[in-house]
């Protein structure tokens, strides 16, 4: 079947990094500079993404893969493939349309991005507060009040290795 298909469509033989050039009798031609084709059998090459301004190049474009951008210091990526760069704020702040704003009492943000979130209400999950919340940290919930007998230790667990928002998109 593959042989029949390639006899019918010579373009299917063109590998990634090339395109099927109709102007040259459907010969496989290399992608021109600043363009790429990530799959075989393509009739055109795609223009490479250019990382300009607040974007910076994380991975250069090659003949078989597009460039990848991230953001300059003080900004972070948003959207699929880092389609936007958004201003960082400090922990304990959130970005509003008017700029960075401190979290109100009872809310926190442990990242340089995202919103100020209400502290977890431990009692709603049948637990008690082990460590109070701050603008930068959520409360730490522990066992239910009934489980805490005199002399029971209240040890703050280690912070998670990565909070939501810190993983690459």
């Amino acid at each position: 079947f593959e042989r029949t298909r390639s006899l019918q469509d010579p373009c299917s033989n063109c590998p990634a990094g090339t395109f099927c050039d109709n102007n040259r009798n459907q010969i496989c031609s290399p992608c021109p500079p600043n363009s790429f084709s990530s799959a075989g059998g393509q009739r055109t090459c795609d223009i490479c993404r250019q990382c300009k301004g607040v974007f910076r190049t994380r991975k250069e474009c090659s003949s078989t893969s597009n460039a990848e951008c991230d953001c300059t210091p003080g900004f972070h990526c948003l959207g699929a493939g880092c389609s936007m760069c958004e201003q960082d704020c400090k922990q304990g702040q959130e970005l509003t349309k008017k700029g960075c704003k401190d979290c109100c009492f009872g809310t926190f943000n442990d990242q340089k991005r995202g919103i100020c979130r209400p502290w977890t209400n431990c009692s709603l999950d049948g637990k008690s507060v082990l460590v109070n919340g701050t603008k930068e940290r959520d409360v730490v919930c522990g066992p239910s009040p009934a489980d805490l007998s005199p002399g029971a230790s209240s040890v703050t667990p280690p912070a998670p290795a990565r909070e939501p928002g810190h993983s690459p998109q």
Epitope: E86, P160, R162, P164
Partner: antibody
Framework: QMQLVQSGAEVKKPGASVKVSCKAS????????MHWVRQAPGQGLEWMGW????????NYAQKFQGRVTITRDTSASTAYMELSSLRSEDTAVYYC?????????????WGQGTLVTVSS | SYELTQPPSVSVAPGKTARITCGGN??????VHWYQQKPGQAPVLVIY???DRPSGIPERFSGSNSGNTATLTISRVEAGDEADYYC?????????FGGGTQLTVL
């Protein structure tokens, strides 16, 4: 690709509890808050709450406080929503949805939904 | 608590432009997200942060937000755009959805 797969349909009696699961794949489970949203037949979307997949911290809509518990199992990349003291008005499709990033709060990946029917 | 108001239904002829509004007190200060939901399916994010499109969403979908009204605009409407559309914001401690608008393509 990024996917949220929910547990199957449930039929419950009034007063009972239901626990719906939501298994994440194709992305770092620990990197994104997980939300639960429900939709009664012929009605709009109603937010129930979220869980922080790392700390287990939660936030619930006032309407559901005391009746809903959202948890997670990071080793299984799975979030759970348990609703207790069920009544007929809780008959709905329950969705889990992953939170995106940044200014505001968008839900960029949704599960297929789980129909919970409450009937005597 | 914060409320979002949408018209229950909007009708439009194929190829024309549909505008779906979402009203809320000073909504222009918030980030608005829009979802499309077809019968029997889960919602799909079509606009986020007022006017940005996720990958895979056609350029025909656009959004704007100022004052007390956010608007989802669908240009060159197609039969496949027929669905319910919901706006959504974050307000201090909860996620708030509009009541939804049923878009009918005539």
């Amino acid at each position: 690709q990024m996917q949220l797969v929910q547990s199957g349909a449930e039929v419950k009696k009034p007063g009972a509890s239901v626990k719906v699961s939501c298994k994440a794949s194709g992305y770092s489970f620990g990197g994104y808050y997980m939300h639960w949203v429900r939709q009664a037949p012929g009605q709009g979307l109603e937010w129930m709450g979220w869980v922080n997949p790392n700390s287990g911290g939660t936030n619930y809509a006032q309407k559901f406080q005391g009746r809903v518990t959202i948890t997670r199992d990071t080793s299984a990349s799975t979030a759970y929503m348990e609703l207790s003291s069920l009544r007929s008005e809780d008959t709905a499709v329950y969705y889990c949805a992953r939170e995106g990033y940044g200014l505001g709060l968008d839900l960029d990946v949704w599960g297929q939904g789980t129909l919970v029917t409450v009937s005597s | 608590s914060y409320e979002l108001t949408q018209p229950p239904s909007v009708s439009v002829a194929p190829g024309k432009t549909a505008r779906i509004t979402c009203g809320g007190n000073n909504i222009g200060s918030k980030s608005v997200h829009w979802y499309q939901q077809k019968p029997g399916q889960a919602p799909v994010l079509v606009i986020y942060y007022d006017s940005d499109r996720p990958s895979g969403i056609p350029e025909r979908f656009s959004g704007s937000n100022s004052g007390n009204t956010a608007t989802l605009t669908i240009s060159r409407v197609e039969a496949g755009d027929e669905a319910d559309y919901y706006c959504q914001v974050w307000d201090s401690s909860s996620v708030v959805f509009g009541g939804g608008t049923q878009l009918t393509v005539l």
